[in-house]
Amino acid sequence: PEPPTACREKQYLINSQCCSLCQPGQKLVSDCTEFTETECLPCGESEFLDTWNRETHCHQHKYCDPNLGLRVQQKGTSETDTICTCEEGWHCTSEACESCVLHRSCSPGFGVKQIATGVSDTICEPCPVGFFSNVSSAFEKCHPWTSCETKDLVVQQAGTNKTDVVCGPQDRLRA
């Protein structure tokens, strides 16, 4: 008869036997019998299995292709896959990080809200009133307009989201 509550955690049912799953880092060679436990073998170099399993083949570690702008962030083990990330100045195009693209720059009139990482692109925001950015940059935030008053100057030309204000001397009344 079948066991009353199937099999325990980390086991599987085959030929009316509850067999132990192979532990992470090992693959199945042969199912258990009444007299022998499951036969498992360690994964080879550059292979892994990250769960208790009955897989007959281990998975290949991910290859971080430098031609796609990738580099190894964390080397894989027999129990974990390799983790790739992007070269400096680049970020992953997806969560799986299968390829990289150059970080975007924020155009004039926009500043960096969040600097890009290996896995996320630059986040830009429009410069609000009182701030400007006159460069295309992946790092620069919006800068506040110069305060002419604190320099005892007056605004000669109003600022925009792309340009700073232009300050000039105050007109003196002539006698």
Partner: antibody, heavy 123, light 107 residues
Framework: EVQLVESGGGLVQPGRSLRLSCAAS????????MHWVRQAPGKCLEWVSG????????HYADSVKGRFTISRDNAKNSLYLQMNSLRAEDTAVYYC????????????????WGRGTLVTVSS | DIQMTQSPSSVSASVGDRVTITCRAS??????LAWYQQKPGKAPKLLIY???YLESGVPSRFSGSGSGTDFTLTISSLQPEDFATYYC?????????FGCGTKVEIK
């Protein structure tokens, strides 16, 4: 409380019989294979016998085959070991042990043990 | 039957010490090895199964490693309650067999 309690040990003469019992509580007894393991004074632990949840897989160590009989009564949450033709070398503490699986009495490890019952075979 | 050989048979150690016990199988047993702790007059207690997996409720100072024929039980920082006898057991094939134990004593 999850526990196993053995009983039935004692002093017995060579060639005589003894029946050990093990009362299980705190878990679903008929979900698991069960075993008897013994330890002679100053000796290693020795697996004696195992029985699957449904009693359809029963196995013995060569040293007791033909003399000992393992059985279980799932309705009573009890495991038994009938020991016949006892010998001096059967003197040991006998432990009842639970297997974490259900289906084989031939192999396994033991995730719950009783405190044991002493069997002394001597004239 | 598969023979299990434990070493050393006894070890003297102090509280806080790192203790390592080894177990060797006479045949390859993959990772199917369990470790037990037993105190005098008490029931043996499962510590580790499948060579390196800690049984629920067992303190993390206990760890197991190895596969094939050579296995190790390590107690990273010995506590007063750890003075006991430790046994290995293969559960790879019939019949299950045990090592003869390693007694961890107070130095």
């Amino acid at each position: 409380e999850v526990q196993l309690v053995e009983s039935g040990g004692g002093l017995v003469q060579p060639g005589r019989s003894l029946r050990l019992s093990c009362a299980a509580s705190g878990f679903t007894f008929d979900d698991y294979a069960m075993h008897w393991v013994r330890q002679a004074p100053g000796k290693c632990l020795e697996w004696v016998s195992g029985i699957s949840w449904s009693s359809d897989s029963i196995h013995y160590a060569d040293s007791v085959k033909g003399r000992f009989t393992i059985s279980r009564d799932n309705a009573k949450n009890s495991l038994y070991l009938q020991m016949n033709s006892l010998r001096a070398e059967d003197t040991a503490v006998y432990y009842c042990a639970k297997d974490p699986t259900a289906t084989t009495g031939a192999r396994g490890y033991f995730d719950l043990w009783g405190r044991g019952t002493l069997v002394t075979v001597s004239s | 039957d598969i023979q299990m050989t434990q070493s050393p048979s006894s070890v003297s150690a102090s509280v806080g010490d790192r203790v390592t016990i080894t177990c060797r199988a006479s045949k390859v047993i993959s990772s199917w090895l369990a470790w037990y702790q037993q105190k005098p007059g008490k029931a043996p207690k499962l510590l580790i199964y499948a060579a390196s997996y800690l049984e629920s409720g067992v303190p993390s100072r206990f760890s197991g490693s190895g596969s094939g024929t050579d296995f190790t039980l390590t107690i990273s920082s010995l506590q007063p309650e750890d003075f006991a006898t430790y046994y290995c057991q293969q559960h790879s094939s019939f019949p299950p067999t045990f090592g003869c134990g390693t007694k961890v004593e107070i130095k």
